[in-house]
Interface confidence: medium
């Protein structure tokens, strides 16, 4: 089956600087700035565009150690993400895989929301854990937090 | 429900070897890193090391290093902790728990198993 | 020696609140949103209480909670109860620190 769950959360980031930071150097900046969550991504093939393979590689003590993650699509105009978990972490038993969509929008304050879609694809009747679903909102919190707090403190930063 | 359940007292000699074991249920046992806790009697908790049992990768902490070993049969969902020659000193009471979190809290926790050596 | 520092005791009557303290670094407690805190009754394994500096697990009471200013997180137990009498715990994520360590241990008495 096909679950899907949305998440909106907003940033004091304007929408093209964040795109930038979090998106496009997503790979170098995120684990410098949040080691705590991931240590390492490494690029198994692709050059960024569609198609790429990355392993994301997770500090020791974290359930699971590491994911492998597809790009799906790169939107650089209307600063849309999406990329497929495809093997790793939660996929593998009773899920195939998750597909996400990131669209990061502008909002008048000079700011913008960050609208996420989560699709878990599961085996057969296998229904997605709440738990699942939290730790993986949470993740993403946490590493959103991480780069806006880098980009505050170095304003001159991804600009 | 995520539950770790742990193997019963223990009375030893010194000298003498040890393995206590650790089961766990409830989740993807393979996918979650273990920890062993020490507690000596009337002390506080010491973490000795961790395990992931996916692939046996494991971390001691150093004062823990080349004292114990630590191992993980994911086929029967068991940690293990072992001692080839035990001493008095390591009289105390042993937990093992999942870590979990981002990364690192320590939820679920075994009942503990207590370890007497004594001559 | 603990690089989580946490006064041996604290006590409180039956409805005060108490606060107990746990002090480190900006290598750990004041680095990350990572500090949790854990109950141990004579006896019995440590439970959790707090995780990520202010959450609480289902099944605690609303009367725990954790808080954090700098390099110092607390947690604070209010309407103190007898069954709140028992040894707490800190633990902080760390970069760079090759083991996990617990703050020494603050023995609460509900007096």
């Known amino acids: 089956g096909v679950f899907n769950y949305e998440i909106e959360t907003t940033s004091v980031i304007p929408a093209a600087r964040l795109f930038k930071a979090f998106i496009l150097d997503g790979d170098n900046l995120v684990p410098k700035v949040a080691p705590q969550a991931i240590s390492s991504v490494e690029n198994i093939e692709g050059n960024g565009g569609p198609g790429t393979i990355k392993k994301i590689n997770f500090p020791e003590g974290f359930p699971f150690k590491y994911v492998k993650d597809r790009v799906d699509e790169v939107d650089h105009t209307n600063f849309k993400y999406n990329y497929s978990v495809i093997e790793g972490g939660p996929v593998g038993d009773t899920l195939e895989k998750i597909s996400n969509e990131i669209k990061i929008v502008a909002t008048p304050d000079g700011g913008c929301v960050l609208k996420i879609s989560n699709k878990y694809h599961t085996k057969g009747n296998h229904e997605v854990k709440a738990e699942q679903v939290k730790a993986s909102k949470e993740m993403g919190e946490t590493l959103l937090r991480a780069v806006e707090s880098y980009l505050l403190a170095h304003s001159d930063a991804y600009n | 429900e995520v539950q770790l359940v742990q193997s019963g007292a223990e009375v030893k000699k010194p000298g003498e070897s040890l393995r206590i074991s650790c089961q766990g249920s409830g989740y993807r046992f393979s996918n979650y890193w273990i920890a062993w806790v020490r507690q000596l009697p009337g002390k506080g908790l010491e973490s000795m090391g961790i395990?992931?049992?996916?692939?046996?990768?494991?971390r001691y902490s150093p004062s823990f290093q080349g004292q114990v070993t630590i191992s993980a049969d994911t086929s029967t969902r068991t940690a293990y902790l072992q001692w080839n020659s035990l001493k008095a000193s390591d009289t105390g009471i042993y937990y093992c728990?999942?870590?979990?979190?981002?990364?690192?809290?320590?939820?679920?926790w075994g009942q503990g198993t207590r370890v007497t050596v004594s001559s | 020696s603990y690089e989580l520092t946490q006064p041996p005791s604290v006590s409180g009557s039956p409805g005060q609140s108490v606060t107990i303290s746990c002090t480190g670094t900006?290598?750990?407690?004041?680095?990350?949103?990572?500090v949790s805190w854990y109950q141990q009754h004579p006896g019995k394994a440590p439970r959790l209480m707090i995780y990520e500096d202010t959450k609480r697990p289902s099944g605690v009471s609303h009367r725990f909670s954790g808080s954090k200013s700098g390099n110092t997180a607390s947690l604070t137990i209010s309407g103190l109860q007898a069954e709140d009498e028992a040894d707490y715990y800190c633990?902080?994520?760390?970069?760079?620190?090759?083991?996990?360590?617990f703050g020494g241990g603050t023995k609460l008495t509900v007096l």
């Open positions: 728990v999942r870590l979990g979190g981002i990364p690192d809290w320590f939820d679920p």
């Open positions: 900006s290598s750990d407690v004041g680095g990350y949103n990572l």
């Open positions: 395990i992931y049992p996916g692939d046996s990768d494991t």
């Open positions: 633990y902080s994520y760390a970069t760079g620190r090759p083991s996990r360590l």
